[in-house]
């Protein structure tokens, strides 16, 4: 299991509306350039086996490859949401550096896997993807954290 | 195809004691939480509790003390037990899986099995 | 805990009618709810969650929207078969575990 108390997120961190706002703003205008609408990243399958207690680690993991194999080499686009919510992204993955899992986190890694091998196998459209569901990785961020 | 089963309803005396019993198939209990939920005759629907995938139990702070929600896995069933039970506990009790999606989703549902308490 | 207060709490409506149901939540729950159909004698059947996502199998005709305290489920022309009553139910986070999980109090869908 995780060691909860650092797999947490402050509610305050998402009581934020400009930033929050911003945030949906940024997918939804990504998702109007995503035309592959059969594939979800972040959904069933992502949690697939993942109890409570390890939700908010898995969530880390994908905060953190959207950060690094997605936003940071798409900072360039979606401006002038990106520049905004790129740095309050990076701030949360920031606070959760020290969550981490005790056991074995193989089943969380091998769904994250699957999410990052989706996005590469899909390119640019991957990307795309990724930040067109912005809205769904900040609400499952929150959900599996505060 | 998936599949939930109710059992173990009926007609028991105030104060008495219940298990209801949810067998599942077409999935595994070790990879999905799964909830109990009961509807009151002529009411709407009232969460119980659930139990995770790691098997821990959370529950309705009405609920706490008198049910317990337990499972199976080797039977592929999900326990109700509920105890000093009441005339207010008749109810047709539900049982349905939790699909986390980012966010708690609950399907699909077991067809119910009905609960009369009454002496 | 959450309180989710639907209107109205039973309506008449006849087939191609367009029906509006409306959930309010005594907090903000951002997208955190679904709604659910449920017929006489059977189960709730899931139909729309994240508060406007579609789940499988569900016709088109069905809608749902809002976000924060406010939320709609639209049907925007009455079939016969959606004579039920509709159920929404919130997830709140964060908060003690004993009120993860609220439902509204249904609006019954009658037929005219």
């Known amino acids: 299991a995780p060691i909860s108390s650092h797999c947490r997120l402050d509610k305050s961190n998402f009581q934020q509306p400009y930033i929050t706002n911003r945030t949906f703003m940024l997918a939804k205008e990504a998702s109007l350039a995503d035309n592959n609408t059969d594939v979800r990243l972040i959904g069933e399958k992502l949690f697939h086996g993942v109890s409570m207690s390890e939700r908010c680690y898995l969530m880390k993991q994908v905060l953190n490859f959207t950060l690094e194999e997605v936003l940071f080499p798409q900072s360039d686009r979606f401006q002038p949401y990106m520049q905004e919510v790129v740095p309050f992204l990076a701030r949360l993955s920031n606070r959760l550096s020290t969550c981490h899992i005790e056991g074995d986190d193989l089943h969380i890694q091998r769904n994250v896997q699957k999410l990052k091998d989706t996005v590469k196998k899909l390119g640019e459209s991957g990307e795309i993807k990724a930040i067109g569901e912005l809205d769904l990785l900040f609400m499952s961020l929150r959900n599996a954290c505060i | 195809e998936v599949q939930l089963v109710e059992s173990g309803g009926g007609l028991v005396q105030p104060g008495g004691s219940l298990r209801l019993s949810c067998a599942v198939s077409?999935?595994?209990?070790?990879?999905?939480?799964m909830i109990w939920v009961r509807q009151a005759p002529g009411k709407g629907l009232e969460w119980i509790g659930i139990i995770d995938i790691d098997a821990s139990t959370y529950y309705a702070s009405w609920a706490k003390g008198r049910f317990t929600i337990s499972r199976d896995s080797s039977k592929n069933t999900v326990y109700l037990q509920m105890n000093s039970l009441r005339a207010e506990d008749t109810a047709v009790y539900y049982c349905?899986?939790?699909?986390?999606?980012?966010?708690?989703?609950?399907?699909?549902w077991g067809q119910g099995t009905l609960v009369t308490v009454s002496s | 805990a959450v309180v989710l207060t639907q209107s109205p709490s039973s309506l008449s409506a006849s087939v191609g009618d367009r029906v509006t149901i409306t959930c309010q939540a005594s907090e903000d729950i951002y997208t955190n709810l679904a709604w659910y159909q449920q017929k006489p004698g059977k189960a709730p059947k899931l139909l729309i969650y994240?508060?406007?996502t579609l789940a499988s199998g569900v016709p088109s005709r069905f809608s749902g929207s809002g976000s924060g305290t406010d939320f709609t489920l639209t049907i925007s022309s009455l079939q016969p078969e959606d004579f039920a009553t509709y159920y929404c139910?919130?997830?709140?986070?964060?908060?003690?575990?004993?009120?993860?999980?609220?439902f509204g109090g249904g609006t019954k869908v009658e037929i005219k």
């Open positions: 139910q919130a997830c709140v986070y964060g908060n003690s575990a004993d009120s993860r999980y609220t």
């Open positions: 349905a899986r939790d699909r986390f999606v980012g966010v708690d989703i609950f399907d699909p």
């Open positions: 994240w508060a406007s």
């Open positions: 077409g999935f595994s209990l070790s990879s999905y939480a």
